[in-house]
Interface confidence: low
């Protein structure tokens, strides 16, 4: 580390005294200090001397002795006060720029120690300083002003009481800067904009920033509009306007809109689309078959998506029949808006139950009339089946009928023993019935099937067996025949009750 | 602030016509519907209709279709009501009112105007 | 059209207690009904939108219930200026209709 001579920290002199500093190192050594006149330099090696014949109040200042070489960068400094009964201040600078929220120093040096306890900060025109305003004094580097705000821009002096008035610095301004984290903020609205040709309309694009120095432009596809600018000052925020009124669109004012800003951080940019239509109009659309099949007691969400302009003035969900006047429950239809023209529309049908099938029409109104979307729904239902002994045609015939959906397929099971289902050990003949009579049919019903199976002879120690299945379940019914007459047992497991 | 400034009180002979006017400000006139209410003697309130300023478009009560008609003018955020062969059962009290710009929040009636009162009488 | 039907047009409440006010639709209205104070000589006030809503600056001891076809409107902590008239109305399908109104007087 540097040594300087003389070895002290401060050292006082007269104006017009001659001010000999030496600094001595293991190696070259450099003097830094604030600029001033009259000191000349003298340098053989390790040693420097800084000296003036005349100093003056301007000298006042800390001199720093480095040693460029030294690894540990170690260095030695002496403060010199030039006490001028009628310069207390040296300002080493009239412009001080810092951010918002840095610590200014306002770099008035005491050229007299002894001041120190009448020194004080003012504003230019012996204004006091503002509220809120934190600051310290150091006799060896002036004013700090901590944490500066933007409000605190201002021409400042340095005061100090000398024989009982004050005595003021030359004028210091502050220049606090707003920190700018990016381009300005910016906002252009509406997101998207739909329009019947001849009706008014108005695009906002505004942009924001902390400085007040930036650039805000409106484009129609790529054509620079020329629109007047509001400026405003609000949130410690500067805004700009610029507000695009169309009093009676037409498809030429169709198209993109890009408002555009920008600042020495850079640019933003955000577009909107803007269509022009020719009448109202209201589109009912879904993503969902309009034709739905659910198995009974399961749930079914129907969505319709709905663009529309002008905004809907009404809209239901309606149940058009055919088994019941229900109509849904209002809490089950559920409305969410993607944006100002599109919106999603879900009726919830839970635990659906037979009598909810059929057509559920979703209505929606807007000045450009109705529109209506229909979903037809149709229940599955795993078979039901029964078996009787009757003889047709003078045969004995047994017949069984399956009702389900979708439209049950038939297999009659002959085995051996009384049983409530034939088991494969068990099973003495298998027939598939390719083409059951179809009973009945209509459409959100079950469909109800007939096969016959002609028995010459009902063996008595057999089973016969009518399976139904579908793409839900199946269902059975076996017949036992006993010797008393036909008698019929349809296992407990394939009672169904929906 | 949004204000709703309605013409004054009207004594009007049977089988005239009269028009009352709604001026609107403290908003953007376009972006909301003006419904028309009556009052009758100080308690039922009747919906007559509405008007989309933005394109003119109107849709009424069935019950005061041919009664009321409903106008608006853009360049002065003005909405008008037209009662036509007026008699003694349209003395009322008339409210313009904004209404909701779309479905997502209804029509609520927000704002109304202060009144205007029509006296039917010869 | 629907029919909106208020049960009582008249109800007198002791200051500071609690009321409730009903609104029946003669059809399903999915929540779009609305309450309106009407204070003598004053226009209708809006309250409550949605059936749930409550407006800005309306005081909290206001609130709205119900679903389907029946509503409520609930006052607590009764104060001498919630004396007035107040509808309800649904704006679920043109024509908007209003209820008959309720007259709230205090005891």
């Known amino acids: 580390i540097p040594v300087i001579e003389p070895s002290v920290p401060e050292l006082v002199v007269k104006p017009g005294a001659t001010v000999t500093l030496r600094c001595v190192g293991n190696g070259s050594v450099e003097w830094d200090g604030p600029p001033s006149p009259h000191w000349t330099l003298y340098s053989d090696g390790s040693s420097s001397i800084l000296s003036t014949n005349n100093a003056t109040f301007q000298n006042t200042g800390t001199y720093r002795c480095t040693e460029p070489g030294d690894p540990l960068g170690g260095s030695a400094a002496i403060h010199l006060y030039v006490k001028d009964p009628a310069r207390p201040w040296n300002v080493l600078a009239q412009e001080v720029v810092v951010f918002e929220d840095q610590d200014a120093l306002l770099p008035c040096l005491l050229t007299d120690p002894v001041l120190e306890a009448g020194v004080s900060l003012v504003r230019v025109r012996g204004r006091p300083l503002m509220r809120h305003t934190n600051y310290s004094f150091s006799p060896w580097h002036g004013f700090t002003i901590h944490r500066a705000k933007f409000i605190q821009s201002q021409d400042y002096q340095c005061s100090a009481l000398m024989g009982g008035r004050k005595v003021m610095s030359i004028s210091i301004r502050l220049k606090v800067q707003k920190v700018i984290p990016g381009p300005p903020a910016l906002t252009l609205v509406p997101a998207e904009l739909v329009r019947i040709r001849g009706e008014a309309a108005q695009i906002v694009c505004s942009a924001s920033s902390v400085d007040v120095n930036f650039d805000v432009f409106l484009q129609h596809n790529n054509t620079k509009l020329a629109i007047p600018q509001q400026s405003d000052f609000h949130n410690n925020r500067y805004q700009k306007v610029l507000t695009l009124n169309l009093d009676q669109v037409d498809f030429q004012h169709a198209g993109n809109y890009s408002c555009v800003a920008s600042n020495v951080q850079g640019k933003h940019s955000t577009s909107m689309f803007f269509r022009v239509v020719e009448s109202a109009y209201l589109n009912l659309s879904s993503e969902q078959n309009l034709i739905q099949e659910v198995t009974v007691g399961e749930g079914l969400n129907l969505k319709v998506m709905v663009e529309a302009y002008p905004g809907l003035q009404g809209f239901n969900w309606t149940y058009l029949g055919p088994f019941s006047d229900h109509q849904p429950e209002p809490k089950l239809a559920n409305a969410t808006t993607k944006d100002t023209y599109r919106h999603t529309f879900t009726l919830s049908l839970p635990r659906l139950k037979p009598s909810e099938a059929g057509r559920y029409s979703f209505l929606a109104r807007n000045p450009g009339g109705w529109r209506a979307l229909t979903f037809e729904l149709t229940l599955r239902y795993p078979p039901e089946v029964s078996v009787i002994w009757t003889f047709i045609n003078g045969s004995g015939t047994l017949l069984c009928a399956a009702s389900g959906y979708p439209q049950p397929n038939v297999t009659w099971l002959q085995c051996s023993g009384h049983t409530d289902r034939c088991d494969e050990a068990q099973v003495l003949q298998v027939w598939d019935d390719p083409y059951p009579e179809v009973l009945s049919q209509e459409p959100f019903h079950k469909v109800t099937v007939q096969s016959l199976l002609t028995v010459e002879t009902l063996e008595h120690n057999q089973t016969y067996e009518c399976r139904a299945h579908n793409s839900v379940g199946s269902g059975s019914w076996a017949f036992i025949p006993i010797s008393a007459g036909a008698h019929t047992h349809p296992p407990d497991e394939f009672l169904f009750t929906p | 602030e949004v204000q709703l400034q309605q013409s004054g009180p009207e004594l009007v002979k049977p089988g005239a016509s009269m028009k009352i006017s709604c001026k609107a400000s403290?908003?953007?006139?376009?972006?909301?519907?003006v419904n028309w209410v009556k009052q009758s003697h100080g308690e039922n309130l009747d919906w007559i209709g509405l008007i989309i300023p933005y394109n003119g478009g109107t849709s009424y009560n069935h019950n005061f279709r041919g009664k009321a008609t409903l106008t608006v003018d853009k360049s002065s955020s003005t909405a008008y009501m037209e009662l036509l062969s007026l008699t003694s059962d349209d003395s009322a009290v008339y409210y313009c009112?904004?209404?909701?710009?779309?479905?997502?929040?209804?029509?609520?009636?927000?704002?109304w105007g202060q009144g205007t009162s029509v006296t039917v009488s010869s | 059209d629907i029919q909106m039907t208020q049960s009582s047009s008249y109800l007198s409440v002791s200051l500071g207690g609690t009321v409730t006010i009903n609104c029946k639709a003669s059809?399903?209205?999915?929540?779009?009904l609305a309450w309106y104070q009407q204070q003598p000589g004053n226009a209708p006030r809006l309250l409550i939108s949605g059936a749930t809503s409550l407006e800005t600056g309306v005081p909290s001891r206001f609130s709205g219930g119900g679903s389907g076809k029946d509503y409520s409107l609930i006052i607590t902590s009764l104060q001498t200026e919630d004396v007035a008239t107040y509808y309800c109305q649904q704006y679920w399908s043109i024509p908007w209709t209003f209820g008959g109104g309720t007259k709230l007087e205090i005891k």
């Open positions: 009112t904004r209404g909701g710009g779309d479905f997502t929040t209804g029509y609520t009636m927000d704002y």
């Open positions: 403290g908003y953007s006139f376009t972006d909301y519907t």
């Open positions: 059809d399903h209205i999915h929540n779009w």
